[in-house]
């Protein structure tokens, strides 16, 4: 065991248990948890005579450390006298000493409640030149108390003559005031009112709170997720406005397109936050084709209290494209958790950073809440990577031991998806570690003309030609999904194969 200094505790009797005619009384000092031996215990008995006896050290079974008790028996006018027990442990250091000063007996007492109150700000939320802190020490059995003010743990030189004590029934209350300059208060220091009473310490601390009034409104505009864009085929963008002060004025969020074309109907949501600020979101459905072709969307935020409108814009990310690589792993069985396994998926070297990660089980997409996926981080090269983690249960892998991690990304060809299957028990599942590709999406052709529509751009289905389900699952000719283009004056489009 390594060197350990002792903890020291005074040992006293309850005053009510000492006979009033007792001519001598014994008190003690416990030194415990030290290593190695020895400790030296000495007593300061003031003007009284006393005899001391230090008991042999005992070993504490669990830790192998030692404990010892020193007893002091005094006679005479001991009732008003204070005694000090000094414990020295030279193995800790040559000058290691702990002093405990206490009286012969302890009275039953009600401890105080310590609470710091602070002076108010002015009406505009600004601090006055000086700030008053009031320490309320309340509800304790009358007796001597000492109040100390600390600044970041250091004792302050404070005039305590202003402290006033009042008694209500059998309990007493004391208050002490501390005046600080605005500069000290704003410096973010912590102020503590420390109360010593009956050998115990009670305290409360305070500091300047974080600004509750927002320093400024912020607005953010998101891009559609690749899942919404390429799979769900109903992309949306969201304008998020945060740190609004709740007030009578209305926040207006207006959408526009750089091309000047009309925008769809947006949905708006307001939420009051815990810090008292307001968050407003507006979600706008955008056309798949419009987004892919590079349309720019603008969100304009106006409010009576804003000096000028906030403008945010978003468009498809430019720059080089790279498809993601997907690797899926199952962690080995961990002792004590035989009925759970963690699956991990590394998706890397993709550009741009917009990516959606999905997990599938039993050929069904699992909820996003089931997995935890990191934000895209830059690789050492020019691409990005994410990790995704899915916890699975025995019931799931016994139902079907194949889980699929899928990345949806614009550069993934031909279907904007790359996926990898993984099994908890690969040997039993018939080796599913190989890459699994989704069936290719087939381009959308016109039912009335040959070749590809120009808008398809060679690799993207016509945005309003919704993928049917194919085969017997969809009305229409076998192996062919028919869907009608909604725009006027254009021929209907059909899929020339399975989705």
């Amino acid at each position: 065991a390594s060197t350990q200094s002792p903890s020291v505790f005074p040992l006293t009797r309850c005053c009510k248990n000492i006979p009033s005619n007792a001519t001598s009384v014994t008190l003690g000092c416990l030194a415990t948890g030290y290593f190695p031996e020895p400790v030296m215990v000495t007593w300061d008995t003031g003007s009284l005579n006393g005899t001391t006896m230090t008991l042999p050290a005992t070993t504490l079974t669990l830790s192998g450390h030692y404990a010892t008790i020193s007893l002091l028996t005094v006679s005479g006018a001991w009732a008003k006298q204070m005694f000090t027990c000094r414990v020295a442990h030279t193995p800790s250091s040559t000058d290691w000493v702990d002093n405990k000063t206490f009286s012969v007996c302890s009275r039953d007492f009600t401890p105080p409640t310590v609470k710091i109150l602070q002076s108010s700000c002015d009406g505009g939320g600004h601090f006055p030149p000086t700030i008053q802190l009031l320490c309320l020490v309340s509800g304790y059995t009358p007796g001597t108390i000492n109040i100390t003010w600390l600044e970041d743990g250091q004792v302050m030189d404070v005039d305590l003559s202003t402290a006033s004590t009042t008694q209500e029934g059998e309990l007493a209350s004391t208050q002490s005031e501390l005046t600080l300059s605005q500069k000290h208060w704003l410096s973010d220091r912590t102020y503590t009112c420390q109360v010593t009473y009956q050998g115990h310490t009670f305290e409360d601390s305070t500091k300047k709170c974080a600004d509750s009034n927002p320093r400024g409104v912020s607005a953010y505009l998101s891009r559609p997720s690749p899942f919404d864009l390429f799979i769900r085929k109903s992309p949306t963008i969201t304008c998020l406005v945060v740190d609004l002060a709740p007030s009578k004025g209305t926040v207006n969020l207006t959408w526009s397109r750089a091309s000047g074309k009309p925008v769809n109907h947006s949905t708006r949501k307001e939420e009051k936050q815990r810090n008292g600020t307001l968050t407003v979101t507006s979600t706008l459905p955008v056309g798949t084709r419009d987004w892919i072709e590079g349309e720019t969307y603008q969100c304009r935020v106006t409010h009576p209290h804003l000096p000028r409108a906030l403008m945010r814009s978003t468009t498809k990310t430019s720059g080089p494209r790279a498809a993601p690589e997907v690797y899926a792993f199952a962690t080995p069985e961990w002792p004590g958790s035989r009925d759970k396994r963690t699956l991990a998926c590394l998706i890397q070297n993709f550009m741009p950073e917009d990516i959606s990660v999905q997990w599938l089980h039993n050929e069904v997409q699992l909820p996003d809440a089931r997995h935890s996926t990191t934000q895209p981080r830059k690789t050492k090269g020019s691409g990005f990577f994410v990790f995704s983690r899915l916890e699975v249960t025995r019931a799931e892998w016994e139902q079907k031991d194949e889980f699929i991690c899928r990345a949806v990304h614009e550069a993934a060809s031909p279907s904007q998806t790359v996926q990898r299957a993984v099994s908890v028990n690969p040997g039993l599942a018939g080796g599913s570690a190989q890459s699994q590709r989704a069936p290719d999406r087939v381009l959308c052709h016109s039912g009335q003309q040959q070749g590809l529509p120009r808008a398809a751009g060679g690799s993207v289905p016509h945005p309003r030609c919704h993928c049917g389900a194919g085969r017997a699952d969809w009305p229409g000719p076998p192996e062919l999904d028919v869907c009608v283009e909604e725009a006027e004056g254009e021929a209907p489009w059909t899929w020339t194969g399975l989705c």
Epitope: S234, E363, V364, Q365, L366, P367, S415, A438, A469
Partner: nanobody, 118 residues
């Protein structure tokens, strides 16, 4: 784990109505393609109606105008409202969920609910 539970089947007279429910657990219905299939005794399983991720729906010619598929995101449930029922609609009705990238007939299935039209 992924589970589908159909309910709402029963015996009904011709011309009557029924509403089938398919309660999903372990996944979100609006993130997957949801379909109703039916299988009459001695026949193959046929698609009745499908609802895509974006909410688009399709119905087999034999039920168009009579059956309607819908979904409730909050209840994570898919419905099949069946009106003007005919004796030939008698079958076991199955709920199917599949990932949108998979071809039809794949995915997870419910146990089925029997609809008898007299």
């Amino acid at each position: 784990d992924v589970q589908l539970q159909e309910s709402g089947g029963g015996l009904v007279q011709a011309g009557g109505s029924l509403r089938l429910s398919c309660a999903a657990s372990g996944f979100i219905v609006s993130d997957n393609v949801m379909s109703w299939y039916r299988q009459a005794p001695g026949k193959q399983r046929d698609m009745v109606a499908t609802i895509m991720l974006n909410g688009d729906t399709a119905h087999a010619d034999s039920v168009k105008g009579r059956f309607t598929i819908s979904r409730d995101h909050a209840k994570n449930t898919v419905y099949l409202q069946m009106n003007s029922l005919k004796p030939e609609d008698t079958a076991v009705y199955y709920c199917n969920a599949r990932d949108s990238m998979l071809e039809p007939g794949r995915g997870a299935w419910g146990q089925g609910t029997l609809v008898t039209v007299s």
